[in-house]
């Protein structure tokens, strides 16, 4: 998966894996029964927080073994801890499952820092707070790992929801969601509402709190406000999209739009930060610094290394700008924009020294592998991964953190020409060297 600050390894610097107005969804004819509306049984089925990932409860094997599994739209393997590890409360015990089948094949997944490796097999899998189905899916049983599991995160595996092209060891290993759609009547679509708390959560609070919803097979209208706007999935590997413009407080960054997508732009629930290509990051930080110049922050803050703290309840949200990303729309010559607040890109963290203060980390960071729209972006929106129609939808999340003056927004349409030219074409030779 991605370089740099990616769940499941922490979001500190050293971390690694981690036009026409579109009709509102309710105005459209459902393509499959049960595709839209209310999915009460799946609402609030996620827990966690942006810094350590959002997880869903799953069961594996017969009799079912319950595990918490990180939801990751930036990878394509279903992989679970299958051996004792100091950070795991429980793990998948293949020998106790009568339905486990060994594929007699290993898998090794290295990251910039850290890795996991394991043995491939298949077993019966279900999601208790998901569709009422059981599927036989590929499972990577993690037998060895380094800097992968997070102490106190409360998850024991990872559910890669992206496409087969980036599955390990190769694209012949069918991802979980493909198996689910093939073996059941579940529509080829899922949607995510990740709810940032807006304040740091301790271990017991994470366990007690709701982290959001993963709606499998549909769209729940109670989870968003306003309209859903769709951007095409450029290519089915990661969930790749095209950004055509970036604004800080309404001021255009004025870069060649190819820079925004160099070498790709992806939507990745398994990454904490909004990660931007080097040139874009530098321009964005310069602009954010200028907009927030009434207060001075150390360089370490902008690098994501240092916290900034204010007396509880006095965070000056108003001095920080909003950030807008314009995405290619579905209609020719039409784009739309998603706008996030500092409440999304300043990540609350616990200050060990004092609990009297509200402390934050700057959750925008530099990338050498393109733009990654991680939890920082996703926590502002209800995001629909409409695989059936090769598009991703964004609407303002009903649970996003905001204040009385500003709110996250999804707005359009904007007339935009030659958007296809904003995409970067990765040279063929590079694709085989996807060293995560």
């Amino acid at each position: 998966t991605q370089h740099g600050i990616r769940l499941p390894l922490r979001s500190g610097l050293g971390g690694a894996p981690l036009g026409l107005r579109l009709p509102r969804e309710t105005d459209e004819e459902p393509e499959e029964p049960g595709r839209r509306g209310s999915f009460v049984e799946m609402v609030d089925n996620l827990r966690g927080k942006s810094g350590q990932g959002y997880y869903v409860e799953m069961t594996v094997g017969s009799p079912p073994q319950t595990l918490n599994i990180l939801v990751d739209t930036g990878s394509s393997n279903f992989a679970v801890g299958a051996a004792p590890h100091p950070f795991l409360h429980r793990y998948y015990q293949r020998q106790l499952s009568s339905t486990y089948r060994d594929l007699r094949k290993g898998v090794y997944v290295p990251y910039t820092q850290g890795k996991w490796e394991g043995e491939l097999g298949t077993d019966l899998v279900s999601i208790p707070h998901g569709p009422n189905v059981t599927v036989r899916a590929n499972i990577a049983a993690i037998t060895e790992s380094d800097k992968f599991f997070i102490n106190g995160s409360n998850w024991e595996g990872i559910l890669g929801l992206a496409y087969a092209e980036i599955a390990r060891p190769d694209d012949s290993l069918e991802p979980f969601f493909d198996s689910l759609v093939k073996q059941t009547h579940v529509p080829n679509l899922f949607s995510l509402q990740l709810c940032g708390a807006g304040f740091p959560l301790n271990q017991s609070e994470v366990l007690a709190s709701v982290g959001g919803s993963m709606i499998i097979g549909g769209i729940d209208h109670s989870l968003y406000t306003g309209s859903l706007w769709y951007t095409p999935i450029r290519r089915e590997w990661y969930y790749e999209v095209i950004i055509v413009r970036v604004e800080i407080n309404g001021q255009d960054l004025k870069m060649d739009c190819k820079e925004y997508n160099y070498d790709k732009s992806i939507v990745d629930s398994g990454t904490t930060n909004l990660r931007l290509p080097k040139k874009v990051f530098e321009a964005a930080v310069k602009s954010i610094k200028a907009a927030s110049s009434t207060e001075k922050f150390p360089d370490g803050f902008w690098l994501g290394e240092q916290l900034v703290c204010w007396q509880a309840g006095t965070t000056p949200w108003n001095i920080f700008p909003v950030i807008s990303l314009y995405l290619m729309g579905e209609v020719t010559n039409q784009s739309f924009r998603i706008t996030i607040l500092p409440q999304q890109y300043l990540r609350p963290v616990e200050d060990v020294a004092t609990s009297q203060d509200d402390c934050y980390k700057f959750a925008i960071s530099q990338s050498s592998t393109g733009t990654v729209m991680g939890a920082v972006i996703m926590e502002g929106f209800y995001v629909v991964f409409d695989r059936a129609r090769k598009r991703i939808g964004f609407a303002v999340s009903a649970c996003h953190v905001h204040d009385e003056f500003r709110t996250a927004a999804v707005e359009g349409p904007f007339v935009t020409l030659d958007m296809e030219d904003c995409g970067y074409n990765i040279p063929q030779t590079d694709e085989s060297t996807l060293m995560t």
Partner: nanobody, 127 residues
Framework: QVQLQESGGGSVQAGGSLRLSCAAS????????ISWFRQAPGKEREGVAA????????FYADSVKGRFTISQDNAKNTVYLQMNSLKPEDTAIYYC????????????????????WGQGTQVTVSS
């Protein structure tokens, strides 16, 4: 040097018409888009209409669709904005602007995309 000169502004009653002209001179290379923008007192500059100098492709802001028409006369290097059914909310200074080079992800109704601007002409619509 490069110049854009607007003319045709003035005062008119609601429901009336005006025709603005933008004469372009000094351009050594072809112009990609020419647009009309307007700015009312205390408001941001907003895109009204845009035309591609080559193919005559046009775009309009929702607020003026069906009332305003942008056109060009290449022989005279002039772009026109025909404004019909004028409303008091159309009162503003109207500017024409030119963008020279074709860029990917071009927003024809966004002022930040344009490098050359005229001085503006006042349009006042009274009720």
């Amino acid at each position: 040097q490069v110049q854009l000169q607007e003319s045709g502004g003035g005062s008119v009653q609601a429901g009336g018409s005006l025709r603005l002209s933008c004469a372009a001179s000094g351009f050594t290379s072809s112009v990609y888009y020419i647009s009309w923008f307007r700015q009312a007192p205390g408001k941001e500059r907003e895109g009204v209409a845009a035309i591609n100098s080559g193919g005559g492709i046009t775009f309009y802001a929702d607020s003026v669709k069906g009332r305003f028409t942008i056109s060009q006369d290449n022989a005279k290097n002039t772009v026109y904005l025909q404004m019909n059914s004028l409303k008091p909310e159309d009162t503003a200074i109207y500017y024409c602007a030119a963008a020279l080079s074709r860029v990917p992800g071009f927003f024809p109704l966004f002022p930040s995309q344009y490098n050359y601007w005229g001085q503006g002409t006042q349009v006042t619509v009274s009720s």
